[in-house]
């Protein structure tokens, strides 16, 4: 019993109220003591005794201070479908939730009182949206160039291989079939499994970027059920940071390395601004892609000797933002010298694409330090890759414009896996479920 | 039991306005695309527009573009039409259709019995 | 006129068979799904096939659907007098348009 036993039940002054935990009652007309969490009032209190408390009988709890004449039930058994979160103790109701692979359809105050699995996105279908705790899964057709062969709440569409020869062309729901010859995989931004909210999904469970819903999802007209397939191959995408960011590294290095040198031989100091721009990809038009949607400039001090780049998806629909796209530290507009600015664009390439282009330049201004006129101590250029990985509707050597104090160091890299697929959507199909679609 | 039911059709001189709407009932209306499909007196079906599930998207055939709008309440369930500059080629019956997204579980194709709109003057 | 080309009209006798076409081309049905919807006099159309070949619930097996190439069919064997009706092919092109055939009006004789 609370402290204040030995001084309850007492009358209140007229027009005071009683203290905490305890509690006016009528019959009495006296301020009584409540019954602590787990207790319930067994025996109410008098002018001259106080409240008798008791425990609470198993399978009843009170989570308050209270005085009610009987503890309250604990909610049923949680059902098959259903996980407990918290277990029926004499202070706290049991909670059931939903367990991996199915979500909330009917909440209730703390917990689920019915849940529904997660349904899954058919072959020719990837995932639009991902189910959550509350919201089932949305899907959308694969875009051309992309396909899902399973049947599935956490696959989105993935890229075709691309096919030196191409034995049998790749559609929604199968990939292309390449002759002997060893393929690539398009690296299509969201060429990933989805990332799978807590305590709702059991499968594929992997953190990866949010999905590209790209131009259109959720479209067409109704359809019907099929077989049911699991499983599902991820496609390599955490590599694509990394090479661009060692590769940006290394340009930078090589730029800085480039300018002490030719400042040691003028004798002149360096004038520290540099900027890199990491990469270019040029948007395709000619699909109707949105290009760099996000660019994200990232700032690293003079003194710094790494670059964090992000790499973003371009996408219209359902994505979030930046749920997966934490921001580096310092990431903040960069503005005045001695900054590193790095920034990415997503883009598209042709379907039927080698290789994206990669445009890397290095800007490295050194000044005189009488005038702080820069003079360009040298000019580097080098192009690698396939040519013919341009994205139609772009121009392929697309160039950032120099004044005449600045350095260029362009490069165009080619990786085995093409940096950004294509980002198109398949239009809609009447009849066909939710089929995404490109801007008109 | 899914249900879309279309109401605003009707007589309209050319030139006019009239809104088309779509009330959905049964399903998780916030969940699926939803189209316009017409169909002229005695003629075949023909796509008009489609909203996309989270309303963000729409699309449209080139011979309504710039006069129709397709838009949607998640809220109220509601699919809406706005047709304006009418002409006499628009008259048709116009159902609403809803997708049912690509689900291996979701047999039911859904379209609205459709509503009239006559464009005379 | 339609993208999708279908037989404007087609007939059969009650318990044959009959096979409704429709043509298209490498950037609609060559490279995406079809769907053939009924729709019966005065009614709004109903799915018949989607995903070339798969039937929804509640569709009788008698009705079958086929991809090939560029071209589709629906098969209708054992027709009946109820199976009178328009039918249409639907498919999807790159050009963000819902594309429908002609429509075949299925005349069941005698």
């Known amino acids: 019993l609370p402290a204040q036993v030995a001084f309850t039940p007492y009358a209140p002054e007229p027009g005071g109220t009683c203290r905490l935990r305890e509690y006016y009652d009528q019959t009495a007309q006296m301020c009584c003591s409540k019954c602590p969490p787990g207790q319930h009032a067994k025996v109410f209190c008098t002018k001259t005794s106080d409240t008798v408390c008791d425990s609470c009988e198993d399978s009843t709890y009170t989570q308050l201070w209270n005085w009610v004449p009987e503890c309250l039930s604990c909610g049923s058994r949680c059902s098959s479908d259903q996980v407990e979160t918290q277990a029926c103790t004499r202070e706290q109701n049991r909670i059931c939730t939903c367990r991996p692979g199915w979500y909330c359809a009917l909440s209730k105050q703390e917990g689920c009182r019915l849940c529904a699995q997660l349904r899954k996105c058919r072959p020719g279908f990837g995932v639009a949206r991902p189910g959550t705790e509350t919201s089932d899964v949305v899907c959308k057709p694969c875009a051309p160039g992309t396909f899902s062969n399973t049947t599935s709440s956490t696959d989105i569409c993935r890229p075709h291989q691309i096919c030196h020869v191409v034995a049998i062309p790749g559609n929604a729901s199968m990939d292309a079939v390449c002759t002997s010859t060893s393929p690539t995989r398009s690296m299509a931004p969201g060429a990933v499994h989805l990332p799978q909210p807590v305590s709702t999904r059991s499968q594929h469970t992997q953190p990866t970027p949010a999905p590209s819903t790209a131009p259109g999802t959720s479209f067409l007209l109704p359809v019907g059920p099929s077989p049911p397939a699991e499983g599902s191959t991820g496609d390599i995408v955490l590599p694509v940071g990394l090479i661009v960011g060692v590769t940006a590294l290394g340009l930078l290095i090589i730029g800085v390395v480039n300018c002490v040198i030719m400042t040691q031989v003028k004798k002149k100091p360096l004038c520290l601004q540099r900027e890199t721009k990491v990469p270019h990809l040029p948007a395709d038009k000619a699909r109707g892609a949105q290009g760099p949607e996000q660019q994200h400039l990232l700032t690293t001090v003079p003194s710094s000797s790494s670059s964090s780049l992000e790499s973003s998806a371009s996408a219209l629909d359902r994505r979030a933002p930046t749920r997966n796209q934490p921001q580096a530290p310092g990431a903040e507009k960069a503005s005045g010298a001695g900054e590193a600015r790095a920034s990415t664009g997503s883009s598209d390439s042709s379907p039927g694409g080698h290789g994206t282009q990669v445009n890397v330049t290095c800007i490295v201004n050194v000044c005189s330090s009488s005038d702080h006129s820069s003079q360009c101590s040298s000019q580097a250029s080098s192009t690698m890759g396939d040519t013919d990985a341009s994205p139609s509707g772009s121009p392929k050597d697309e160039q950032v414009p120099f004044s005449k104090e600045e350095c260029a160091f362009r490069s165009q890299l080619e990786t085995p896996e093409t940096l950004l697929g294509s980002t198109e959507e398949k239009p809609l199909p009447l009849g066909v479920p939710d089929a995404g679609m490109k801007p008109s | 039991e899914v249900q879309l039911l279309e109401s605003g059709g009707g007589l309209v001189q050319p030139g006019g306005s009239l809104r088309l709407s779509c009330a959905a009932s049964g399903f998780t209306f916030s969940a699926y695309g939803m189209h316009w499909v017409r169909q002229a007196p005695g003629k075949g079906l023909e796509w008009v527009a489609v909203v996309s599930y989270d309303g963000r998207e729409k699309h449209y055939a080139d011979s309504v573009k710039g006069r129709f709008t397709i838009s949607r309440d998640n809220s109220k369930n509601t699919l809406y039409l706005q047709m304006n500059s009418l002409r006499a080629e628009d008259t048709a019956v116009y159902y609403c259709?809803?997708?049912?997204?690509?689900?291996?579980?979701?047999?039911?194709?859904?379209w609205g019995q459709g509503t009239l709109v006559t464009v005379s003057s | 006129q339609s993208v999708l080309t279908q037989p404007p009209s087609a007939s059969g006798t009650p318990g044959q068979r009959v096979t409704i076409s429709c043509s298209g081309s490498t950037s609609n049905i060559g490279s995406n799904f079809v769907y053939w919807y009924q729709q019966l006099p005065g009614t709004a159309p109903k799915l018949l096939i989607y995903d070339n070949n798969k039937r929804p619930s509640g569709v009788p097996d008698r009705f079958s659907g086929s991809k090939s190439g560029t071209s589709a069919s629906l098969a209708i064997s054992g027709l009946r007098s109820e199976d009178e009706a328009d039918y249409y092919c639907?498919?999807?092109?790159?050009?963000?348009?819902?594309?429908f055939g002609g429509g075949t009006k299925l005349t069941v004789l005698g």
């Open positions: 259709a809803r997708s049912d997204g690509g689900y291996d579980s979701d047999s039911g194709y859904y």
């Open positions: 639907s498919s999807y092109a790159y050009s963000d348009n819902i594309l």
